[in-house]
Interface confidence: low
């Protein structure tokens, strides 16, 4: 279904005469009759198989024809058809003189014809107008034409029906070729399937309208990508629904037993940050100016020995200041004005000249270091403390400060981890080289036997249609997570499928 449109533009009849050569009195009051028919190699009279249309009187002799389409007028002329456009046509345009107001064929004298043109050819459906100009001995007609599809018809021949809709059966508009173009938020062959909120989990979430994300049992969150942990789980997480995997520092079936050494003992001093690194194990992150396992020792900015070449460090309120020995200068006494002649090497160090005596290098005896052998070797440099113990210089000797669980001069002895009975629910404790291991009694599992193992309600595969089964530990029952298209407690019912063709 479509419309053949003919736009008359100019008609020239300068002498104001009829086809017979007789002049019109007082001028040729011109109207047009149009006949559209099937393709004929030679256009001949006969039925206008595609339709006819007539105009009112449009002008006298020569005139321009105004485009009146916007005001609901008759130019372009409309020749609708209710069949598949064949791609070819024949067109006859007759210009007639109307002596009076009656334009019916029987009311006109037989010689009222001014001119007649006949064309035929191929014409594809499209928005572009074809321009043409036909000239006879006495007249000239300028016009354009095209074929466009009627509303809801598309394709090369206006044969494809497509009606936009936005209801239960589809949400789409029609493309120029008649194919469906889904409205924003819809997808599928007939645009019936909503596009869920961006990021909504494919298996765990679904939607009934666009930009929605509804969660299946056992899942939560804006995108249904967060599992719901075991009912009553306090300080734990899950990777699949109904689990309760304890956070660091928490234990027990519901992760409500505080195993957090930092919280219980506050071992870190001077505003340090405490981090649990396992049961009864912690790490202190010291604030600037403090050191030690528990950040209990105040650190001078001079402790880092920033002054070179024997310079002495002096604390200041904001930082430090280096007092340089003779022959040195700079913020850290890093620049030298000395040579070997000035005996710059301390503590028996031997001087070696470099760059033709421009500067020097000291070779230090054992237990001394520094560019001028001015520093005693730090007894802690060799890091003698084992198992993460901290070495502290204390006068002429040194000592090791051990981490919890270790003892001995060099923190080399392991304190038994099992002494604190860490295994829950009657588990047996075994001391290992790097910690401990619990052997759990029947019905319990986990690092510390803190998880009660339930009867596996999913063992009998109760869920249908490839649904995922989860065990609810609090009730020893199962929950089925249905795939798209199935519902029911066991995912046994398919969702009603859409009709095969919704039009």
């Amino acid at each position: 279904s479509g419309v053949f449109q003919l736009q008359l533009q100019e008609f020239i009849n300068e002498r104001g005469v009829l086809a017979s050569g007789r002049p019109c009195e007082p001028g040729c009051r011109t109207f047009f009759r149009v006949c559209l028919k099937h393709f004929q190699a030679v256009v001949s009279p006969g039925p206008c198989t595609f339709g006819t249309v007539s105009t009112p009187v449009l002008g006298t002799n020569s005139f321009a024809v105004r485009d009146d389409s916007s005001g609901g007028g008759r130019n372009p002329l409309q020749l609708p058809f209710n069949f598949t456009w064949p791609g070819t046509f024949s067109l006859i345009i007759e210009a007639w003189h109307a002596p009076g107001d009656d334009l019916r064929p029987e009311a006109l004298p037989p010689d009222a014809l001014i001119s007649k043109i006949a064309i035929q050819g191929s014409l594809a459906v499209g928005q572009n107008w074809l321009l043409d100009e036909q000239t006879s001995t006495l007249t000239r007609l300028r016009y354009s034409y095209r074929v466009i599809c009627s509303d809801n018809y598309y394709g090369d021949n206006c044969s494809r029906l497509c009606k936009k809709r936005n209801d239960h059966f589809g949400h789409y508009v029609c493309q120029p070729d008649g194919n469906l173009s889904c409205l924003p938020g819809w997808t599928g062959e007939y645009c019936q399937q909503p596009i869920c909120l961006s990021g909504c989990h494919e298996q765990n979430g679904y939607c009934s309208k666009p930009a929605e994300c509804l969660c299946r049992p056992g899942w939560q969150g804006r995108l249904c990508n967060e599992c719901i942990p075991h009912n009553g789980c306090r300080h734990g997480t899950c990777s699949t629904p109904w689990q309760c995997t304890c956070d660091e520092g928490w234990g027990g079936l519901f992760c409500d037993q505080d195993l957090n050494y930092c919280t219980h003992h506050s071992p870190c001093k001077n505003g340090a940050t405490c981090s649990n690194s396992g049961q009864r194990s912690y790490t202190c992150t010291c604030r600037p100016g403090y050191t030690g396992v528990d950040c209990e020792l105040e650190l001078s900015e001079c402790d880092s020995n920033p002054c070179r070449n024997g310079g002495s460090c002096k604390d200041q309120e904001d930082g430090y200041h280096c007092l340089c020995p003779p022959g040195y200068y700079g913020l850290h006494c890093e620049h030298s004005t000395l040579s070997c002649a000035d005996s710059p090497c301390f503590n028996g160090g031997s001087c070696r000249e470099r760059n033709q005596g421009a500067n020097y290098a000291c070779e230090c005896p054992p237990n001394f270091t520094g560019s001028n052998c001015e520093k005693k070797v730090d007894r802690c440099t060799s890091n003698p403390c084992a198992n993460g113990g901290q070495c502290l210089n204390r006068g002429p000797s040194r000592m090791c400060r051990c981490r919890p669980g270790f003892t001995g001069t060099y923190c080399e002895l392991h304190v038994s981890d099992c002494a604190r009975n860490p295994c829950a629910h009657g588990g047996t404790c075994h001391d290992l080289e790097n910690g401990l291991m619990c052997t759990c009694p029947a019905g319990f599992s986990g690092r510390r036997c803190e998880v009660r193992t339930s009867i596996d309600a999913c063992a009998s595969s109760p869920c249908f249609n490839r649904a995922t089964c989860y065990t609810d530990l609090s009730t020893d029952t199962f929950v089925c997570n249905c795939p798209y298209g199935f519902v029911g407690s066991r995912c046994e019912f398919p969702v009603g499928l859409p009709p095969s063709f919704p039009w």
Epitope: A64, D67, S69, W129, L130, L131, D132, E133
Partner: antibody
Framework: QVQLVQSGAEVKKPGASVKVSCKAS????????MHWVRQAPGQGLEWMGI????????SYAQKFQGRVTMTRDTSTSTVYMELSSLRSEDTAVYYC???????????????WGQGTLVTVSS | EIVLTQSPATLSLSPGERATLSCRAS??????LAWYQQKPGQAPRLLIY???NRATGIPARFSGSGSGTDFTLTISSLEPEDFAVYYC??????????FGQGTKVEIK
């Protein structure tokens, strides 16, 4: 977008001929009439003629009849305007302009070439 | 052929002022009249067609009126970029398409 690109400036001697080209792009070449308009230095606009690119038919202003020839090449979407027997008063900028006809600015000139200066001097 | 006469030949105004340009046809052209703007070294630019319709992208300060033989182009408040030559053109009776001789709007 619609573009009309004209050939470069020309200098001719009196009595010679000049052929100016106008290459169209961005639309269906055969669907729109093309006009030629000229403008002498410091003067107004003067319509020269029209060509139908679809069939090649033309219409010229009486003043240029016999001296002007408008042609087109659909394979390159180009129209040409040739003016012969040049005289000094033909010195002008020559424009091609596409005629709008469909619904809105009917038979007016929405799209113009950039113009070609033709200088006639001995 | 239809002759179009524009007046005044030159109009000297300041930015912000109202400009009124006239175009008179030697015989009726109904409403088949257009207005163009041309700046030095540039091609004309269509402003108004069919006497009163603004072309695409033309600011609202440009308006056209009239029918038959008397037509007016009004620029409600001149902007610096509006100083140019303005031509009227008819397409009622062709060939030829005819233009007026132009009105130059210059800065006072």
């Amino acid at each position: 977008q619609v573009q009309l690109v004209q050939s470069g400036a020309e200098v001719k001697k009196p009595g010679a001929s000049v052929k100016v080209s106008c290459k169209a792009s961005g639309y269906t070449f055969t669907s729109y009439y093309m006009h030629w308009v000229r403008q002498a230095p410091g003067q107004g606009l003067e319509w020269m003629g029209i060509i139908n690119p679809s069939g090649g038919s033309t219409s010229y202003a009486q003043k240029f009849q016999g001296r002007v020839t408008m042609t087109r090449d659909t394979s390159t979407s180009t129209v040409y305007m040739e003016l012969s027997s040049l005289r000094s008063e033909d010195t002008a900028v020559y424009y091609c302009a596409r005629e709008e006809y469909s619904g809105s600015s009917a038979e007016y000139f929405q799209h113009w070439g950039q113009g070609t200066l033709v200088t006639v001097s001995s | 052929e239809i002759v179009l006469t524009q007046s005044p030949a030159t109009l000297s105004l300041s930015p912000g002022e109202r400009a009124t340009l006239s175009c008179r046809a030697s015989q009726s052209v109904s409403s088949y009249l257009a207005w163009y703007q041309q700046k030095p070294g540039q091609a004309p630019r269509l402003l108004i067609y069919d006497a009163s319709n603004r072309a695409t992208g033309i600011p609202a300060r440009f308006s056209g009126s009239g029918s038959g033989t008397d037509f007016t182009l009004t620029i409600s408040s001149l902007e610096p970029e509006d100083f140019a030559v303005y031509y009227c053109q008819q397409r009622s009776n062709w060939p030829p398409w005819t233009f007026g001789q132009g009105t130059k709007v210059e800065i006072k």
